[in-house]
């Protein structure tokens, strides 16, 4: 990338240089960095045109254009581990020098979907064709290359150097040559704008004569945002030419004096600046240079201007337009931040509400608070949520898990709880016996009793009636098969002692459904579940112990 093939374009507040070189993206970026720049950004169509201009310069310097495609690195890259994001204009890529993502893009084709590898972007050029202003180079993404292996068709790179301001090119009022040396070590004689801190070497004269004089100037910031050379009057003036050479070096009007001297002047509405060459608008804001809601503020002495944005907006890279500030980048909220035009708002996650110390803070909503509990029975508040629980004998139900449903212990997975008949109740169950049998004191077994016809018998008295234990059942859990039936004293949790009290749902039974005397028989009452007889139950002589069971498919079957 020698100086003999330098190409440079300066515009706005930046200069672009284009270079030949089969280098990796990292090597190219290092070369740009060495001179205080970065691989170029292409954040707008205007910037794309500047980059195209500098590439056109570079291609003109190539003696013979070859019929091939060539790629030139720009500063758009996606780091390892950052995935392609089709929802964004830059597809998850970002500019190496930093700065905001912009809506402009010019992708060549659909991008390769990847996350693992670092990916870099180059401008794709047909090196056999002259660059046309209407056809801006397309962006091509691919591997970033490595030293000695830059990647396929990589021919060079474009750097960008940003400055606080620019000086106008020096205008000569007579024959001479200006050579600019920029802070990024480029020399040029044809810059449309010259960056701050550049040096200008002016050699006056025809060049082949000995009457040449040399002048040396520096582009300085004369006042805030006012940049000029500190020269006064046109350079290399010659009475021989007067206003006829390059308009005397004047920006607008040139007035000749009778003695061969001349002066520069300005048109109505403009005034002559301190360099006695350049004209500036009396009101620099008269041309409405600021856009996007920005306010134009004239600079001192009617020179230059600055654009100012309303609160919540900031100037973009052109310093003329306002773009929304994404306040959410600074994480001002405790939980969720929503950026809005000119502002932002904080939101809380489900289960939280605004409140607590600090701006944008969120506090847990106590869903279990008095009067707002969504649960039918137990409610436990948790951070950002809650969960419902049920008393023993119930399980969580309902599509949102807030209701409690009675567990039918008589069909529980733990096997039979009663030796003969089982009656489900709200939150519990009771045992009973078939005609001719009575419930044993343990409330579970059946013992042979006086023969009688009628409904199944319950326990002999109320002595076992006790409180049901109030421990909760975890969500989706089933009732423990070891839990005793209603009426079991707490002191004997291992013994199942069901109770059939006077309010038990028993209906009288027609004689024809009863089994022959002396047999436990089959009790077919829809609300009653039959279980296998316990081994301890007495069996009448000569009688079969025929017991009803419930099959897995929910139908009754006889064992």
């Amino acid at each position: 990338t020698g100086a003999d093939t330098e190409a440079v374009v300066c515009a706005g507040t930046a200069c672009y240089t284009a270079h030949w070189g089969k280098l990796s993206a990292a090597e190219a970026q290092n070369l740009c960095l060495q001179n205080g720049g970065n691989l170029a950004t292409v954040k707008s169509e205007e910037e794309a045109q500047h980059v195209q201009q500098v590439l056109a310069q570079l291609l003109r310097r190539e003696a013979a254009l070859t019929a091939r495609m060539g790629k030139f690195w720009i500063g758009l890259q996606r780091e390892k581990g950052k995935c392609l994001d089709p929802s964004l204009p830059l597809k998850g890529f970002s500019w190496v020098g930093g700065g905001e993502d912009t809506p402009y893009s010019n992708w060549h084709k659909e991008l390769r979907n990847s996350c693992i590898s670092k990916r870099c972007v180059s401008l794709l050029l047909d090196l056999s064709q002259p660059l046309l202003p209407g056809r801006l180079p397309k962006w091509s993404e691919g591997p970033c290359g490595s030293p000695g292996s830059p990647g396929s068709n990589i021919e060079g790179f474009v750097c960008k150097f940003s400055f606080k301001g620019m000086c106008r090119p020096l205008a000569l009022g007579g024959p001479g040559q200006v050579t600019y040396t920029t802070p990024f070590q480029t020399t040029s004689s044809s810059l449309e704008a010259v960056p701050f801190a550049s040096a200008a070497n002016v050699a006056c004269g025809e060049g082949d004569k000995d009457d040449s004089q040399s002048h040396y100037f520096l582009c300085k910031e004369k006042a805030p945002d006012v940049f000029d050379w500190g020269s006064s009057g046109p350079l290399c003036v010659s009475p021989k030419y007067g206003c006829n050479f390059n308009n005397g070096g004047c920006h607008q009007d040139c007035f000749e004096g009778g003695d061969g001297s001349f002066l520069c002047g300005c048109r109505p509405g403009f005034r002559l600046l301190d360099d006695l060459v350049t004209c500036a608008s009396r009101n620099p804001c008269s041309s409405s240079p600021c856009r996007g809601g920005a306010t134009c503020i004239p600079g001192p002495h009617g020179k230059n201007y600055t654009c100012r944005c309303p609160q919540g907006y900031q100037l973009d890279s052109s310093q003329l337009d306002c773009v929304d500030v994404d306040e959410c980048q600074d994480s001002p909220c405790a939980q969720e931040c929503v950026n809005t035009p000119g502002s932002f708002r904080c939101e809380c996650w489900v289960g939280y509400e605004p409140g607590g110390p600090g701006e944008g803070a969120c506090q847990d909503v106590d869903e279990c608070a008095l009067g707002r509990s969504p649960c039918a029975q137990g409610c436990t508040n948790t951070e950002g949520s809650f969960h419902c629980s049920c008393e023993e004998g119930y399980v969580l139900a309902g599509e949102d898990g807030t209701q409690c449903q009675d567990v039918d212990e008589c069909v529980g997975p733990g096997g039979p709880l009663c030796d003969s008949l089982c009656f489900n109740t709200q939150g519990s169950f009771r045992c009973g016996c078939l005609p001719g049998w009575v419930l044993a004191p343990n409330g579970v077994s059946c013992a042979m009793g006086p023969v009688s016809l009628g409904p199944p018998s319950g326990p002999p008295d109320e002595e076992y009636k006790g409180e049901r234990e109030g421990s909760t059942v975890p969500p989706a859990a089933t009732a423990s098969p070891t839990r005793g039936p209603e009426g079991t004293p707490k002191s004997t949790p291992t013994t199942r002692r069901p109770l059939l009290s006077s309010d038990a749902p028993i209906t009288s039974v027609p004689l024809e459904v009863l089994a022959p005397s002396g047999s436990p028989g089959l009790w077919r009452e829809p609300s009653i579940h039959h279980t296998t007889a316990a081994s301890g139950a007495q069996e009448p002589a000569g009688g079969d112990s025929s017991v009803a069971t419930q099959n897995d498919d929910g139908t009754d079957g006889q064992k």
């Epitope: 581990g81 995935c83 994001d85 979907n113 996350c115 693992i116 590898s117 591997p143």
Partner: antibody
């Protein structure tokens, strides 16, 4: 259509190494990354790492660095995972997977899995 | 690493019921990078919902997904027998990719 065909089940001795293969078909092999996932009853699904066949670049879960090495062979359109210094903890089903044309690491295609049993 | 916690671990539902399972992340996840997989016994996982709410090809419309930040959920509006499976959430917010421990859905 995209298919990922994995090598058969392996029974290996503790301390040994094993190399699992995943042959891709139905697409251009270098277009999609290939990732590997381990499944055990205790730890469920664990991402081991991935490889970009175009560049050979890899990304690993720190928990598997030194245990797994990922490679890809463009000529045979196959991805490989070598597991070394095997212990009973490495007994698992291993899947190769990729996200095809979907974005954001949504794994759209999965191999049938290779069961590795480490036992003496 | 970003740990995903799924709840409940096991759930049971009758056909026609609506069910919701949740996935909580230990740190925020972009909704684009949160996905759900269905796995049936002896089979490979299948992508079921991608980028929080997009149904993968062939997934019935009774499935839906929602969420943002650290809290995400998968809902089945009316469960069918064929939905019995284990559902895993998965996220990417920088390496490593992580999966949830799964929610096993049983049909009564």
């Amino acid at each position: 259509q995209v298919q990922l065909q994995q090598s058969g089940a392996d029974l290996v001795r503790p301390g040994a190494s094993v190399k699992l293969s995943c042959k891709a078909s139905g697409y251009t092999f270098t277009d999609y990354e290939m990732h590997w996932v381990k499944q055990t009853p205790v730890y469920g699904l664990e991402w081991i790492g991935g490889i970009d066949p175009e560049t050979g670049d890899t990304a690993y879960n720190q928990n598997f660095k030194g245990k797994a090495t990922l490679t890809a062979d463009k000529s045979s359109s196959a991805a490989y995972m070598e597991l070394r210094s095997l212990t009973s903890e490495d007994s698992a089903v291993y899947y190769c997977t990729n996200y095809g044309n979907l974005y954001y690491y949504a794994m759209d295609y999965w191999g049938q899995g290779t069961s590795v049993t480490v036992s003496s | 690493e970003n740990v995903l916690t799924q709840s409940p671990a096991i759930m049971s539902a009758s056909p026609g019921e609506k069910v919701t399972m949740t996935c909580r992340a230990s740190s925020s996840v972009s909704s684009s990078y949160l996905h759900w997989y269905q796995q049936k016994s002896g089979a490979s996982p299948k992508l079921w919902i991608y980028s929080t709410s997009n149904l993968a090809f062939g997934v019935p419309a009774r499935f839906s997904g929602s969420g943002s930040g650290t809290s995400y959920s998968l809902t089945i509006s009316s469960v069918e027998a064929e939905d019995a499976a284990t559902y895993y959430c998965q996220q990417y917010s920088g390496y490593p990719l992580t999966f949830g421990s799964g929610t096993k859905l049983e049909i009564k």
